[in-house]
Interface confidence: low
């Protein structure tokens, strides 16, 4: 679990505790829903999503979904509750600090999905686990 921020004033509807009783608060995720993407045949991509949002519910994590078919490539960025399936798949890696893509079986397309639990972690989607960017400029994605 990502260590929680200490909050001075808490709305009751925001209070959620992890297994150790620590209070968790909503995290920041890229949230552009589905957009066309140029990410293809790369070890890692930036989302190019210009919207950073704080998830509605404290238990939600960041999710990215990369899809390729005969016509286009899309990248979906959202918040989602890991207790619930997304695109019919369980978010197995929701506790990961990085968004490491895993291929899922979907007829008629190539489908990768990742989830993660650190702020804006679905901004940098990783297709190769050993990949580690050394260029900080790549991480500077303007947000709103």
């Amino acid at each position: 679990t990502i260590p929680p921020h200490v909050q001075k004033s808490v709305n009751n509807d925001m209070i959620v505790t992890d297994n150790n009783g620590a209070v968790k608060f909503p995290q920041l995720c890229k949230f552009c829903d589905v957009r066309f993407s140029t990410c293809d045949n790369q070890k890692s991509c930036m989302s190019n999503c210009s919207i950073t949002s704080i998830c509605e519910k404290p238990q939600e994590v960041c999710v990215a979904v990369w899809r390729k078919n005969d016509e286009n490539i899309t990248l979906e960025t959202v918040c989602h509750d890991p207790k619930l399936p997304y695109h019919d798949f369980i978010l197995e890696d929701a506790a990961s600090p990085k968004c490491i893509m895993k291929e899922k079986k979907k007829p008629g397309e190539t489908f990768f999905m990742c989830s993660c639990s650190s702020d804006e972690c679905n901004d940098n989607i990783i297709f190769s686990e050993e990949y580690n960017t050394s260029n900080p400029d790549l991480l500077l994605v303007i947000f709103q």
């Epitope: 919207i51 950073t52 704080i54 702020d119 303007i142 947000f143 709103q144």
Partner: antibody, heavy 122, light 107 residues
């Protein structure tokens, strides 16, 4: 109660520098992105800059890029705007504002300071 | 940058009137549209976010609608404290841009 109090404004000559501060209280500072917005006398609102809660991500309006630097000290609950190479057209009231915390409010500034006036003139 | 155009730039109205202000974006911004009220010498105040969501503490006579490129702020029954300048702002992409403002004056 959320409070944002700006300071550091004043009269400065063209080409000069100024550092604005914004002291925040009443909320958890480090989970909110913060922005600076300015308003020239008798004119409308102009967004200047934004910084993420951790300070790791920043963005600037083209009109100030390369001259202004936004930063924050989360241990002091303080937001800063370092303004260099100031021009007459930078004359404005500068507001610090908090970005909202929930999904669709994330792009809206839900609390604003009272503003501090920066006058660039010889 | 996305351009935001408000109309009218000013209007005169009486207490009790229904007032409508429109805002048009130069491209689709989905529902990422916010409305602010500003009184002379004061900081702006958030009224509406996400096109139609009323900010906490804002009277229910204020409402917002629209999506895509066309948006509306409505004050159902103008009160004396509502005479101010109103700004729309898109938060779809950086830089977030404001409309030029609509000044609501007493008739």
């Amino acid at each position: 109660e959320v409070q944002l109090v700006e300071s550091g404004g004043g009269l400065v000559q063209p080409g000069g520098s100024l550092r604005l501060s914004c002291a925040a209280s009443g909320f958890t500072f480090d989970i909110n992105a913060m922005t600076w917005v300015r308003q020239a006398p008798g004119k409308g609102l102009e967004w200047v800059s934004v910084i993420s809660g951790s300070g790791g991500t920043t963005a600037y309006a083209d009109s100030v890029k390369g001259r202004f630097t936004i930063s924050r000290d989360n241990s002091k609950n303080t937001l800063y705007l370092q303004m260099n190479s100031l021009r007459a057209e930078d004359t404005a009231v500068y507001y610090c504002a908090r970005r909202g915390q929930y999904r669709y409010i994330a792009g809206a500034t839900d609390y604003w300071g009272q503003g501090t006036l920066v006058t660039v003139s010889s | 940058d996305i351009q935001m155009t408000q109309s009218p730039s000013s209007l005169s109205a009486s207490v009790g009137d229904r007032v409508t202000i429109t805002c048009r974006a130069s491209q689709s911004i989905s529902s990422y549209l916010n409305w602010y009220q500003q009184k002379p010498g004061k900081a702006p105040k958030l009224l509406i976010y996400a096109a139609s969501s009323l900010q906490s503490g804002v009277p229910s006579r204020f409402s917002g609608s629209g999506s895509g490129t066309d948006f509306t702020l409505t004050i159902s029954s103008l009160q004396p404290e509502d005479f101010a300048t109103y700004y729309c702002q898109q938060s779809y992409s950086t830089p977030p841009t404001f409309g030029q403002g609509t000044k609501v004056e007493i008739k």
